[in-house]
């Protein structure tokens, strides 16, 4: 586990779990139900879900200087997606396929967020908006877009942890 006061997390463990997350996110995506691509709309990105951006300190230099900024951002994102995957968007009808990896994905998000959360120390969780109720007709598109955003998020997180494991591990 990461330790309060800015010490390093268990980079190798984080790397392994984030790689597992990548695999799960990609395998979950086609299984959320048939999605007509015309339903996607034009917007490629949305403010409804977290993204890792340039100013978040997740570049090699930023990680070297102070990895806590980036790790906090990743932690916030993991908590956000964990909340989304546990909401009625994914748990309500139309039901997911019985073999859907969304349950595993949900558990792995929680696992990685706990690995990053220092004992006895709580990062400020940037306002995670309360989720509005969704109706079944909305859910296929919501699932599709959330998982697509999650894929991008965990891909960046995995690169961060791979870099950390290779260059920042004690």
């Amino acid at each position: 586990r990461a330790v309060p006061g800015g010490s390093s997390p268990a980079w190798t463990q984080c790397q392994q779990l984030s790689q597992k997350l990548c695999t799960l996110a990609w395998s979950a995506h086609p299984l959320v139900g048939h999605m007509d691509l015309r339903e996607e709309g034009d917007e490629e990105t949305t403010n409804d879900v977290p993204h890792i951006q340039c100013g978040d300190g997740c570049d090699p230099q930023g990680l070297r200087d102070n990895s806590q900024f980036c790790l906090q951002r990743i932690h916030q994102g993991l908590i956000f997606y964990e909340k989304l995957l546990g909401s009625d968007i994914f748990t309500g009808e139309p039901s997911l396929l019985p073999d859907s990896p969304v349950g595993q994905l949900h558990a792995s998000l929680l696992g990685l967020s706990q690995l990053l959360q220092p004992e006895g120390h709580h990062w400020e969780t940037q306002q995670i908006p309360s989720l509005s109720p969704s109706q079944p007709w909305q859910r296929l598109l919501l699932r599709f877009k959330i998982l697509r955003s999650l894929q991008a998020f965990v891909a960046v997180a995995a690169r961060v942890f791979a870099h950390g494991a290779a260059t920042l591990s004690p």
């Epitope: 339903e39 403010n47 139309p94 509005s132 109720p133 079944p136 909305q138 919501l142």
Partner: antibody, heavy 117, light 107 residues
Framework: EVQLLESGGGLVQPGGSLRLSCAAS????????MTWVRQAPGKGLEWVSG????????WYADSVKGRFTISRDNSKNTLYLQMNSLRAEDTAVYYC??????????WGQGTMVTVSS | DIQMTQSPSSLSASVGDRVTITCRAS??????LHWYQQKPGKAPNLLIF???NLHSGVPSRFSGSRSGTDFTLTISSLQPEDFATYFC?????????FGHGTRLEIK
């Protein structure tokens, strides 16, 4: 009192544009998805478009896809429908409605859009 | 798209009558069927949601039920204010679709 109030309807020529607004009051607008439903004169109800609470996710009926754009400004408690390339068959009363937990639970009074040359 | 077939399209009845309106979905929609009432020149109002639940303020003479993909709206004893048009709607899949309506008139 929970209320939705549409505005912006009127007479427009085929191919023209119009922007409808729906002002919400009496509830936490940013916590709800919203939708537009229309009703042609003497006809039934037709769902047009929907938008998720914070605006990043949108849905459209095939009949309006590529021509209409739904948006919202949560700071102003207002829902919008930008309608381009209007056709005679878009003539209808347009209602905004709140997407409740189960159904469209609150409706505005409607605004009439007439597309005619 | 899921088609909602509503019947009858119009109905004449008297105050005090028991009236039933039916709606059939072209495929399974679970219990995601709702009923709205609309009076001339006014917006629709939600009456019943999720098959059988009365929206707030709706009198108990209104009720809803389901058998498979067939849904029924029943008014146990018609009152003068109940003469209106009634629509069913499914919220199970995109796009949400409505029945064509049942116009309830005074006999």
């Amino acid at each position: 009192e929970v209320q939705l109030l549409e505005s912006g309807g009127g007479l427009v020529q085929p191919g023209g544009s119009l922007r409808l607004s729906c002002a919400a009051s009496g509830f936490t607008f940013s916590a709800y998805s919203m939708t537009w439903v229309r009703q042609a004169p003497g006809k039934g109800l037709e769902w047009v478009s929907g938008i998720y609470s914070s605006g990043g996710f949108t849905w459209y009926a095939d009949s309006v896809k590529g021509r209409f754009t739904i948006s919202r400004d949560n700071s102003k408690n207002t829902l919008y429908l930008q309608m381009n390339s209007l056709r005679a068959e878009d003539t209808a009363v347009y209602y905004c409605a709140r997407v409740g937990l189960w159904a469209f639970d609150i409706w505005g009074q409607g605004t009439m859009v007439t597309v005619s040359s | 798209d899921i088609q909602m077939t509503q019947s009858p399209s119009s109905l004449s009845a008297s105050v005090g009558d028991r009236v039933t309106i039916t709606c059939r979905a072209s495929q399974s929609i679970s219990g995601y069927l709702h009923w709205y009432q609309q009076k001339p020149g006014k917006a629709p109002n939600l009456l019943i949601f999720a098959t059988s639940n009365l929206h707030s303020g709706v009198p108990s003479r209104f009720s809803g039920s389901r058998s498979g993909t067939d849904f029924t709206l029943t008014i146990s004893s018609l009152q003068p204010e109940d003469f209106a048009t009634y629509f069913c709607q499914q919220s199970f899949s995109t796009p949400p679709t409505f029945g064509h309506g049942t116009r309830l008139e005074i006999k």
